[in-house]
């Protein structure tokens, strides 16, 4: 990536890392308002299976692994990107490496959920406090999960689907920070590992993923009021290990693997019309990206 200063524009969709033939160090940003892509400063270490989030206007890249011709190393790293300076800086590492991690943000704290270190599939969860640059373990999930989708709604943290080391999962659970405890919620209609999970209009969406047999294009959403999962329109492409985020009331899914091809496709979901549309292509196909949107 280029090392010049990034333009000072708001509300960009950032995509970090990913995998195509090997783990990638790309950081690129898509501007939905004009359809352009920016090439930004590379990650200091290539990684796939990472997660991205934004706290205080800074982009964080969490976990993943560096799968390269030289070897395969799971990552405990937390790195922080400042859009104003177009520079990455390392933060305190997590307590354990976490590949295919999920993350969520509550009250400015980053929760790192599940993931794997070698053949160890974590149920552990830890919370990062940016102001102290410290991680602390919180209550573990009830289930081991890698390829887990994580979302935050009403200050509750949801962990959805994934792989426990033996089976792909349709189960989901919810973390209550005040009680420091997890509770199971209604299972999805579909087994999904490596799905894209996000929150839009008081619902949790789970898009795509892998059911242990095939990649999926189906999408379902969880209504916290009725505690039910309902299918919405399917994506145009089957995909697992995709990136997902919400921008101005629409869901964006980025890349992923369809069982044969590493997708460059970016689709956008409009909840008002219950339709998906192809909006752009990434500069190259990849799976296992970390995605987040800058705050206003």
């Amino acid at each position: 990536g280029s090392m010049g200063h990034a333009p000072k524009v708001g509300r960009l969709i950032y995509t970090a890392g990913g995998y195509f033939r090997q783990s990638l160090s790309y950081l690129e940003a898509y501007n939905p308002s004009d359809g352009t892509w920016l090439d930004l400063a590379d990650l200091q270490v290539p990684r796939s299976g990472l997660a991205g989030c934004v706290v205080g206007g800074l982009l964080y890249a969490v976990g993943g692994r560096n799968n390269s011709p030289d070897g395969n190393t799971d990552s405990s790293a937390l790195d922080c990107y400042n859009p104003m300076t177009n520079q990455w800086s390392p933060c305190a590492p997590m307590s354990v490496p976490r590949n295919r991690i999920g993350v969520g943000v509550i009250d400015g704290h980053i929760y790192a959920v599940g993931g794997s270190h070698g053949c160890i599939h974590h149920n552990s969860v830890e919370r990062y406090e940016p102001e102290r640059d410290e991680w602390h373990l919180v209550a573990p999930m009830l289930t081991r999960r890698i390829g887990v989708g994580v979302a935050v709604l009403n200050r509750l943290l949801y962990a959805v689907g994934g792989f426990d080391g033996t089976n792909r999962l349709n189960s989901a659970e919810c973390y209550y920070p005040e009680r420091n405890e997890w509770r199971m919620i209604t299972a999805m209609n579909t087994i999904r590992s490596g799905a894209g999970v996000c929150v839009l209009h008081n619902c949790i969406y789970a898009a795509g993923g892998y059911d242990g047999q095939d990649q999926l294009n189906s999408v379902e959403r969880y209504d916290v009021e009725t505690e039910t999962w309902t299918f919405v329109a399917p994506m145009k492409h089957r995909r697992s290990a995709l990136g997902i985020t919400v921008h101005q009331g629409r869901i964006y899914v980025l890349g992923g693997y369809d069982g044969h091809t590493f997708l460059d496709s970016v689709e956008c979901y409009d909840p008002d019309t219950d339709t998906w549309s192809e909006v752009t292509r990434m500069t190259s196909g990849r799976s296992g990206v970390g995605v987040a949107v800058t705050m206003e």
Partner: antibody, heavy 121, light 107 residues
Framework: EVQLVESGGGLVQPGGSLRLSCAAS????????IHWVRQAPGKGLEWVAS????????LYAKSVAGRFTISADTSKNTAYLQMNSLRAEDTAVYYC??????????????WGQGTLVTVSS | DIQMTQSPSSLSASVGDRVTITCRAS??????VAWYQQKPGKAPKLLIY???SLYSGVPSRFSGSRSGTDFTLTISSLQPEDFATYYC?????????FGQGTKVEIK
């Protein structure tokens, strides 16, 4: 019957290329991690490469990284091992295997019959 | 890479004998060890996974155990069809590695 059948082996000169195929029947390769393992004449087993059906990520032994490429075509229910820049020390019987997942660990529970690759001038 | 040191490299035994083969990992591999049987000109067959779990269809005379980084395959009463080469494999850490094999021959 669950079965894997390899093909594509043969005699090739050093520096040459071969593509091995592994045709699956009785199960979908989209549902399994597929591995290649080789065995040099009179020697033990050596893991070579694997492909993850969920993420598409591939892993390689250092001895073949950058020269071999594993791939899968789910529409043909077949996995492949593209071998370039072959060396004499790549001479071996090549097996493809289906990996069984348990407790996060993959074990090869179904093996093909193997195909012999001989690298010699 | 994790080394799997298998012993003995060969052994002679009679039908009905109790046979023990050992594999020592160079570092912790938890219980992520499998055992395979291979006959000449044939592909390996999975016998034991997760150090001590018997794979489906494998006779109960085969068993596996773990003590720290030492792993043992035991054949309680050797049968004529058990004369073969046996390999251990660790899948705990990348790259997966095999022991060098133990050939079980007829005495």
């Amino acid at each position: 019957e669950v079965q894997l059948v390899e093909s594509g082996g043969g005699l090739v000169q050093p520096g040459g290329s071969l593509r091995l195929s592994c045709a699956a029947s009785g199960f979908a390769i989209s549902a399994s991690s597929i591995h290649w393992v080789r065995q040099a004449p009179g020697k033990g087993l050596e893991w070579v490469a694997s492909i993850d059906p969920e993420t598409g990520e591939t892993l390689y032994a250092k001895s073949v990284a950058g020269r071999f490429t594993i791939s899968a075509d789910t529409s043909k229910n077949t996995a492949y091992l593209q071998m370039n820049s072959l060396r004499a020390e790549d001479t071996a019987v090549y097996y493809c295997a289906r990996a069984y997942a348990g407790d996060g660990v993959y074990y090869a529970d179904v093996w093909g019959q193997g195909t012999l690759v001989t690298v010699s001038s | 890479d994790i080394q799997m040191t298998q012993s003995p490299s060969s052994l002679s035994a009679s039908v009905g004998d109790r046979v023990t083969i050992t594999c020592r990992a160079s570092q912790s591999v938890s219980s992520a060890v499998a055992w395979y049987q291979q006959k000449p000109g044939k592909a390996p067959k999975l016998l034991i996974y997760s150090a001590s779990s018997l794979y489906s269809g494998v006779p109960s005379r085969f068993s596996g155990s773990r003590s720290g980084t030492d792993f043992t395959l035991t054949i309680s009463s050797l049968q004529p069809e058990d004369f073969a080469t046996y390999y251990c494999q660790q899948s705990y850490s990348f790259p997966s590695t095999f022991g060098q094999g133990t050939k079980v021959e007829i005495k």
